[in-house]
Interface confidence: low
């Protein structure tokens, strides 16, 4: 199994960033970490979409990664799709410092996320708690600013 | 609130080697995610390096294979070995600890400048 994955994230404007990936043990947990910039100050949802594909930009990775046909919710819930990891906070400079310990994602098995798209919103991720239904779909956190296919790292 | 302290930069030559050090003021054994960040006049702030608590590392392109980092938690403290310093690595470095709550705990930075 792999135990190391990247993703360089880009998308339309300034935001871009690489993110980190490394679990291990199969059934550990996955530190995610690294950086992201050009981003606006505060909280922007950050998700594992369905799809590898970024043919037509982040919006063709589909929705998030849900192999178990949860509603969305945030990280630390019972009930959330695999993806849901939650919100990056960006500073008053616009740079996202990632650091994420998630026992849901995987890097190898049914919750495999490599081969799969990493998304970075335009706005907060309200964890499912937003009070509509698109809150339990993608946590009302707006459009894509930047995403990448998630690869295996040496 | 955890104080920072970076000391080891100075002006060096292309080619040379530095290290930096940060010390922080209490134990930093919770903490997990410690960064090295650096900032040069009239550019955006970037990230240069990171080690969490269980040896995990992150490196910038721009620096892999040139900068080590390292962390000692029994005395508090995070270093930066640079080595085959160029001159585009010329900034105001920066200690800082995972964001959380944002925008976590900085220090007031050492410079380094690489000069012939």
């Known amino acids: 199994m792999a135990t190391k994955a990247v993703c360089v994230l880009k998308g339309d404007g300034p935001v871009q960033g690489i993110i980190n990936f490394e679990q291990k043990e199969s059934n550990g947990p996955v530190k995610v970490w690294g950086s992201i910039k050009g981003l606006t100050e505060g909280l922007h949802g950050f998700h594992v979409h369905e799809f590898g594909d970024n043919t037509a930009g982040c919006t063709s990775a589909g929705p998030h990664f849900n192999p178990l046909s949860r509603k969305h919710g945030g990280p630390k819930d019972e009930e959330r799709h695999v993806g849901d990891l939650g919100n990056v906070t960006a500073d008053k400079d616009g740079v996202a410092d990632v650091s994420i310990e998630d026992s849901v994602i995987s890097l190898s098995g049914d919750h495999c996320i490599i081969g799969r798209t990493l998304v970075v919103h335009e706005k907060a991720d309200d964890l499912g708690k937003g009070g509509n239904e698109e809150s339990t779909k993608t946590g009302n956190a707006g459009s894509r600013l930047a995403c990448g296919v998630i690869g295996i790292a040496q | 609130q955890v104080q920072l302290v970076e000391s080891g930069g100075g002006i060096v030559q292309p080619g040379g080697s530095l290290r930096l050090s940060c010390v922080a003021s209490?134990?930093?054994?919770?903490?997990?995610?410690m960064y090295w960040h650096r900032q040069a006049p009239g550019k955006r702030r970037e990230l240069v390096a990171g080690?969490?608590?269980?040896?995990?590392?992150y490196f910038a392109d721009s620096v892999k294979g040139r900068f080590a980092i390292s962390r000692d938690n029994t005395k508090s403290s995070l270093y930066l070995q640079m080595n085959s310093l160029k001159l585009e690595d010329t900034a105001m470095y920066y200690c800082?600890?995972?964001?959380?709550?944002?925008?976590?705990?900085w220090g007031q930075g050492t410079q380094v400048t690489v000069s012939s």
């Open positions: 800082a600890t995972l964001p959380n709550p944002p925008p976590g705990y």
């Open positions: 080690i969490t608590n269980d040896g995990t590392e």
């Open positions: 209490e134990s930093i054994s919770d903490i997990d995610a």
